[in-house]
């Protein structure tokens, strides 16, 4: 699987999850999030050669098409597969609120 | 929606579904598919600016991050959202077989 366990331990050029730390205030301008200050959102990148963690039949077909037609602009793209939530603390006026934001952390990638 | 109805009728630079005809024999080397000769598989391409058909909270966050940090390599990617099957005819020996291949035709795209 193209997950953090594999990708963070290997120098992988092809589609893999990459570490990306996002600071809410500095990187997004989100002053309203009080905790955490930031988090590892991670991201997916790298080429998707034929059959690499193909998401659907279409991505398999497109991967093969791209292999046999290397000049073509059509090719699968490396995108998130498994995502995890992040719990944040913010204030509505003087009232603290805790919310679980879904799909905030990329744990693995796929070629789609 | 970034679907064929919209994308095929507009000159859209950003993420959209694009027409792509694939000939099974010529483009894939699949001689075993007898019918159809080929089909419109289509594909997704184009930049994913902030909030454009964002698939998850992560893609929204990543889009904003990319907007505020344009030098960053991390950005959402335009990939298939809705796919449709394709029915094909092939032979096993002298016996004709009809099979519906799932997720073969891209009908719409999203930023993931």
């Amino acid at each position: 699987a193209l997950d953090t366990n594999y990708c963070f331990r290997n120098l992988e050029e092809n589609c893999c999850v990459r570490p990306l730390y996002i600071d809410f205030r500095q990187d997004l301008g989100w002053k309203w999030v009080h905790e955490p200050k930031g988090y590892y959102a991670n991201f997916c990148s790298g080429p998707c050669p034929y059959l690499r963690s193909a998401d659907t039949t279409h991505s398999t077909v497109l991967g093969l098409y791209n292999t046999l037609n290397p000049e073509a602009s059509a090719s699968p793209c490396c995108v998130p597969q498994d995502l995890e939530p992040l719990t944040i603390l913010y204030y509505v006026g003087r009232t603290p609120k805790v919310e679980q934001l879904s799909n905030m952390v990329v744990k693995s990638c796929k070629c789609s | 929606a970034l679907d064929t109805n919209y994308c095929f009728r507009n000159l859209e630079e950003n993420c959209c579904v694009r027409p792509l005809y694939i000939d099974f024999r010529q483009d894939l080397g699949w001689k075993w598919v007898h019918e159809p000769k080929g089909y419109y598989a289509n594909f997704c391409s184009g930049p994913c600016p902030y909030l454009r058909s964002a698939d998850t909270t992560h893609s929204t966050v990543l889009g904003l991050y990319n907007t505020l940090n344009p030098e960053a390599s991390a950005s959402p990617c335009c990939v298939p959202q809705d796919l449709e099957p394709l029915t094909i005819l092939y032979y096993v020996g002298r016996t004709p077989k009809v099979e519906q291949l799932s997720n073969m035709v891209v009908k719409s795209c999203k930023c993931s």
Partner: antibody
Framework: EVQLLESGGGLVQPGGSLRLSCAAS????????MSWVRQAPGKGLELVAD??????????YYSDSVKDRFTISRDDSKSTVYLQMNSLRAEDTAVYYC??????????WGQGTLVTVSS | DIQLTQSPSSLSASVGDRVTITCRAS??????????MHWYQQKPGKQPKLLIY???NLASGIPSRFSGSGSGTDFTLTISSLQPEDFATYYC?????????FGGGTKVEIK
């Protein structure tokens, strides 16, 4: 650098009025709630009045000890928060601090202004 | 309103001593994994200064000899090795609900 400069304190007779001002600089004033915290001589800290940002409709809070006598307000265009104090009593004698609380804690404090209520 | 009780109300210690101050809330001031308790230092004639926010986070410019811990109703401020400039009064404050309240203070004096 965040700065909070209080003014308007002084000696006033019981039943009198005073208006405290706090001029803020060095941060996005419009985004944050502002508070007045007082400290009577030799005593602890008491939050007396609080006003949140426009985002939350300038909602105010007052401690029971000053309710109906004190009014907190803010002028975002001047980055200033005010405390109008009426019907002052001897027990209102204290140093009044202007503070900013971006998220639960009072991160920055002014130097304080002394209010003395005495005849 | 949530009441905060600090103990001791005063203590005498020497330079180099490890000092622990506790703050007990009348009800929990934690929400999920977030602990909404904060600590301040005040020296005579000066305004209070934020030391620790959300139970364990060191405020900007505060020396690492200060630390905070706790959750729910019981919280602790620790000075690992007391310095001459640390003799002051320390206050806890919660932000679990409105109104936010302060503890009565703990005065740290020179023995």
């Amino acid at each position: 650098e965040v700065q909070l400069l209080e003014s308007g304190g002084g000696l006033v007779q019981p039943g009198g009025s005073l208006r405290l001002s706090c001029a803020a600089s060095g941060f996005d004033f419009n985004s944050y709630g502002m508070s007045w915290v007082r400290q009577a001589p030799g005593k602890g800290l008491e939050l007396v009045a609080d006003i949140v940002s426009k985002t939350y409709n300038y909602t105010t809070y007052y401690s029971d000890s000053v309710k109906d006598r004190f009014t907190i307000s803010r002028d975002d265009s001047k980055s200033t928060v005010y405390l109008q104090m009426n019907s002052l009593r001897a027990e209102d004698t204290a140093v009044y601090y202007c503070t900013v609380a971006p998220g639960g804690s009072f991160d920055y404090w002014g130097q304080g202004t002394l209010v003395t209520v005495s005849s | 309103d949530i009441q905060l009780t600090q103990s001791p109300s005063s203590l005498s210690a020497s330079v180099g001593d490890r000092v622990t101050i506790t703050c007990r809330a009348s009800q929990s001031v934690s929400i999920s994994r977030f602990n909404l308790m904060h600590w301040y230092q005040q020296k005579p004639g000066k305004q209070p200064k934020l030391l620790i926010y959300r139970a364990s986070n060191l405020a900007s410019g505060i020396p690492s000899r200060f630390s905070g811990s706790g959750s729910g109703t019981d919280f602790t401020l620790t000075i690992s090795s007391l310095q001459p400039e640390d003799f002051a009064t320390y206050y806890c404050q919660h932000s679990r609900e409105s109104p936010w309240t302060f503890g009565g203070g703990t005065k740290v004096e020179i023995k």
